[in-house]
Interface confidence: low
């Protein structure tokens, strides 16, 4: 497994919401859906009402970095997308609100959101070389590739 | 209606092994989670396992990482618990539940006695 990569000397502080309200489709057309309490997995959907609506909020580095820093939170909770290891789901962490400064060990909150034409790529700060994916009879969990799949496509304006 | 009929409990020495059953029915099987757990004497309920829907993802209590395997055959809609290295501690009513941390559903359960 991927050994954590904190770095405990960036400060990331909260600037505002960018996204509201959208939907993470994959390569496969399958949406991010909940699972249960906890995980999430995707799913083909007739019905896009199912899938997980996320806000995406975006941070700002204390060491000027170029890449867009942001959090994923389920749309109207407090339920914000966390990193763990590589291969292992990623889980939804209730906190009274949006951090403010996330620092250390905190940084499995966070993600570099790349965009690639349509495709959208999210690569964990605590993990810089692993990515949100999906995975067949699997949860959306943390990997650096094939098979799972990495790129997701944002679907906006789904309130 | 959903049932939850739990099997295969029992008395066994230390060290020894069981493996529990629990046949659902009402709800469809392959659709849902599945978890088991106990509760010991005079203790309050007690999560042991649970296991995805396609069986893909497990997880474990730390007390019995190693020694219980959880495991499903969604042909037969049936759970399965596989309990080896058996303890005193161990000594319980297990429980087969609908879901993977939070239950809507419990089974009647199935004794089981650690014993010498």
């Known amino acids: 497994s991927a050994p954590f990569s904190f770095l405990s000397n960036v400060k990331y502080n909260f600037m505002r919401i960018i996204k509201y309200e959208f939907i993470l489709n994959d390569a496969l057309n399958q949406s991010i859906i909940r699972a249960n309490d906890q995980y999430l997995t995707a799913a083909a959907l007739h019905n896009l009402d199912e899938a997980v609506k996320f806000d995406m909020g975006a941070y700002k580095s204390s060491k000027d970095d170029a890449k867009i820093t942001v959090i994923l939170r389920i749309s109207k909770t407090q339920l914000y997308v966390t990193a763990q290891d590589e291969d292992q789901p990623v889980l939804l962490k209730e906190m009274p609100e949006i951090p403010k400064t996330i620092t250390g060990s905190e940084t499995n909150l966070l993600f570099f959101w790349e965009t690639h034409g349509t495709k959208n790529y999210f690569t964990s700060v605590a993990h810089p070389n692993l990515f949100i994916a999906t995975k067949q009879d699997y949860w959306v969990c943390l990997a650096g590739g094939p098979p799972s799949i990495t790129d997701f496509q944002i679907l906006e304006n789904q309130a | 209606e959903v049932q939850l009929l739990e099997s295969g409990g029992g008395l066994v020495q230390p060290g020894g092994s069981l493996r529990l059953s629990c046949a659902a029915s009402?709800?469809?099987?392959?659709?849902?989670?599945m978890a088991w757990v106990r509760q010991a004497p005079g203790k309050g309920l007690e999560w042991v396992s649970s296991i995805y829907k396609s069986g893909a993802l497990t997880s474990y209590a730390d007390s019995v990482k190693g020694r219980f395997t959880i495991s499903r055959d969604n042909s037969k809609n049936t759970l399965y618990l596989q309990m080896n290295s058996l303890r005193a501690e161990d000594t319980a009513v297990y429980y087969c539940a609908k879901g993977w941390a939070s239950f809507d559903y419990w089974g009647q359960g199935t004794l089981v006695t650690v014993s010498s």
């Open positions: 009402g709800f469809t099987f392959v659709r849902y989670d």
